[in-house]
């Protein structure tokens, strides 16, 4: 009752290894790292056989099969490349995840390299079995903005792709008679979120209550250049409208809001987010130059009364933009305090424009991003949102445009978007 000699399977071993095996002797068949015991098409870690009374083994020796991690999981906004020939997915094979450049980048500059582990799982040194995250790239237009810009009053036509974050927000309240329709601008922050001014999305009421417009009445256009031709643009409805809870309709303090889009928009050369600044109280430094784009009034001689009486006819067809310097806070406060009327330039606002006038943002540009190029990151950052201006016509002498200081609201914005600030941009101790 001696059993025949055993040959270990390829890439495997039998224990105990003996010259002879007799009745009741048991052996354990196991495989090398990266291989699994395969018996009757069932994978297992080990397999035991026994020498029977009649001198035969209780079972045939199983085979050792290389571990297969199978097809890796798909990455949203990402691609997979196989480093191993024939697109192998077996033990020690390597794959590399990358993001759809130039519109997405990998969070935390992860290598994206995953190796098929002995356990049959794709593993990354940092993330383990978790997939990487592709975040939208921000503040890098496919078309570089010219360094010198003529003086949306005193502005010039924007080329398509110059302001890929620019959104046109159309609000139409059909429940009212006559129909209420107005529009403003906004800035794309991610594939799903638009930043704008709260006054653009406040229901137009006669009292001072602040109630957001119904999300059903909001349409957002992205990648739009000429308002007469919306065919090339992406239009989206709103899933949520979020006004800053402390927006004050009387002095426009906290004039900031967000729109969550119904569906994430596909990013491309004409649709790309702008970057948010760091949380800081100073905001943009005086005399820094920023750019603002919008479809607002581009005729400096049009008064607010004329705009109201003529509806939307005075609006620009083609997206306009203008370059404006940030005005020292004290100078702006003084310029408004000297006017009749209850004007209040708070710490949550900054001003931009020229003392001599002629260049300004105007009605219909509301909510648009005042962007400044950050030399350090080489990206465009939204520092302001077009908020309000004096009673005189746009572009008047010593009437500066007033902008919401976005850097005061970064913590609030990230939280509304459901992203902890530290994930997206770790706070740097200064």
């Amino acid at each position: 009752n001696e059993c025949p000699e055993l040959q270990p399977p390829v890439h495997g071993k039998i224990e105990p290894s003996q010259a002879k095996y007799f009745f009741k002797d048991q052996v354990l068949v196991s495989c090398d790292t990266g291989y699994k015991v395969l018996k009757d098409n069932v994978e297992m870690d080990t397999f035991q056989i026994e020498c029977l009374k009649d001198g035969t083994w209780s079972n045939k020796i199983p085979t050792c099969k290389i571990v297969d991690c199978r097809a890796p999981g798909e990455l949203e906004h990402g691609l997979i490349t196989f480093s191993t020939r024939n697109n192998l997915t077996t033990y020690k094979s390597e794959i590399k995840y990358s993001c759809q450049e130039p519109y997405y980048k990998m969070l935390n500059n992860n290598t994206g390299i995953y190796t098929c582990s002995a356990q049959g799982v794709w593993m990354n040194k940092v993330l383990g079995r978790s997939l990487p995250t592709c975040l939208p790239e921000c503040g890098q237009p496919s078309r570089s903005l010219p360094s010198l810009v003529k003086r949306i009053i005193g502005g010039r036509n924007a080329e398509p792709g110059l302001f890929p974050w620019q959104a046109l927000i159309v609000v139409e309240d059909t429940s009212r008679v006559p129909n209420d329709k107005w529009f403003g601008s906004g800035a794309l922050l991610s594939a799903s979120w638009i930043l704008t001014a709260a006054h653009v999305l406040r229901s137009q009421r006669r009292d001072t209550t602040v109630i957001p417009v119904s999300k059903e009445h909001v349409t957002v256009y992205l990648g739009l250049h000429d308002v007469r031709d919306k065919s090339g643009a992406v239009n989206s409805s709103a899933a949520r409208v979020v006004l800053h809870p402390d927006f004050n309709i009387q002095n426009y303090n906290h004039d900031i809001a967000l729109v969550q889009l119904q569906e994430p928009v596909p990013l491309g050369p004409h649709v790309m987010p702008v970057c948010l600044p760091r949380l800081e109280p100073e905001g943009p430094a005086p005399h820094m130059l920023g750019l603002v784009a919008g479809w607002g009034i581009s005729n400096p001689n049009v008064t607010v009364d004329e705009i109201i009486s003529s509806g939307t006819r005075t609006l620009s067809d083609v997206l306009q933009y203008v370059k404006l310097p940030v005005v020292p806070h004290a100078e702006c406060k003084t310029s408004y305090e000297s006017r009749s009327g209850n004007y209040s330039v708070t710490e949550n606002m900054f001003c931009a424009g020229y003392y001599e006038g002629g260049k300004d943002t105007c009605l219909g540009d509301s909510g648009g991003a005042f962007v400044i190029f950050d030399d350090l990151s080489q990206r465009w950052v939204v520092q302001g949102l077009v908020s309000w201006g004096g009673p005189e016509e746009c572009g008047s002498k010593q009437v500066y445009g007033v902008y919401t200081k976005v850097s005061n609201y970064v913590d609030w914005v990230w939280e509304q978007m459901g992203l902890p600030q530290s994930v997206v941009e770790p706070q740097v101790e200064r």
């Epitope: 809870p245 402390d246 303090n253 800081e280 005061n408 913590d411 706070q427």
Partner: antibody, heavy 120, light 107 residues
Framework: EVQLQQPGAELVKPGASVKMSCKAS????????ITWVKQRPGQGLEWIGD????????NYNEKFKSKATLTVDTSSSTAYMQLSSLTSEDSAVYYC?????????????WGQGTLVTVSS | DIVMTQSQKFMSTSVGDRVSITCKAS??????VAWYQQKPGQSPKLLIS???NRYTGVPDRFTGSGSGTDFTLTISNMQSEDVADYFC?????????FGAGTKLELK
């Protein structure tokens, strides 16, 4: 978890000064204003002033301008308030507090308060 | 300075009652009002911000309302643990100011 730690009590003599601390943890200290509030026994709350640790900028209640000096030590994430020329009117509990959001001055996080007793 | 007036210094109530504490601002503060609860020997605890936004973890029996100059904190179903001082605060402009407080006690 955001925490503000303050010493429990300080006993000081009239005419002297006291410097109380507020040690912050659980967040980036330099990103949020720290506010100081006074409460006399059985009385309401009075805003003294606030300080932005990132730059050292301060805002004071006019009433406390010559009484309180606000400072920070960013290396230890600690805010300080010094009260000078103390009288019995300064006997109170002093709280430090932190805003929830940078731009809105309501206070979600409070220290336990330091009881200052001015007595000879 | 903006004066916040809480006209009721004391309010006596019973468990299960609906209680409304009022606060009046001397000028328009929009919705920039917060409400705090303070129990003896403890620091104030935020209940409401932006006049009506209940803070995380605050029971839904606490409701804030109002805008402009008139604000109300309502406790819809008074509980024994709600016995405390309640303060309103405006943060529309500096200097930040608090109401004198309303002491809520059980009958």
């Amino acid at each position: 978890e955001v925490q503000l730690q303050q010493p429990g009590a300080e006993l000081v003599k009239p005419g002297a000064s006291v410097k109380m601390s507020c040690k912050a943890s659980g967040y980036t200290f330099t990103s949020y204003w720290i506010t100081w509030v006074k409460q006399r026994p059985g009385q309401g709350l009075e805003w003294i002033g606030d300080i932005y640790p990132g730059s050292g900028s301060t805002n004071y209640n006019e009433k406390f301008k010559s009484k309180a000096t606000l400072t920070v030590d960013t290396s230890s994430s600690t805010a300080y308030m010094q009260l000078s020329s103390l009288t019995s009117e300064d006997s109170a509990v002093y709280y430090c507090a932190r805003r929830r959001y940078y731009a809105t001055a309501w206070f979600a996080y409070w220290g336990q308060g330091t009881l200052v007793t001015v007595s000879s | 300075d903006i004066v916040m007036t809480q006209s009721q210094k004391f309010m006596s109530t019973s468990v299960g009652d609906r209680v409304s504490i009022t606060c009046k601002a001397s000028q328009n503060v929009g919705t920039a009002v917060a409400w705090y609860q303070q129990k003896p020997g403890q620091s104030p605890k935020l209940l409401i911000s932006s006049a009506s936004n209940r803070y995380t973890g605050v029971p839904d029996r606490f409701t804030g309302s109002g805008s402009g100059t008139d604000f109300t904190l309502t406790i819809s179903n008074m509980q024994s643990e709600d016995v405390a001082d309640y303060f309103c605060q405006q943060y529309n402009s500096y200097p930040l100011t608090f109401g004198a407080g309303t002491k809520l006690e059980l009958k």
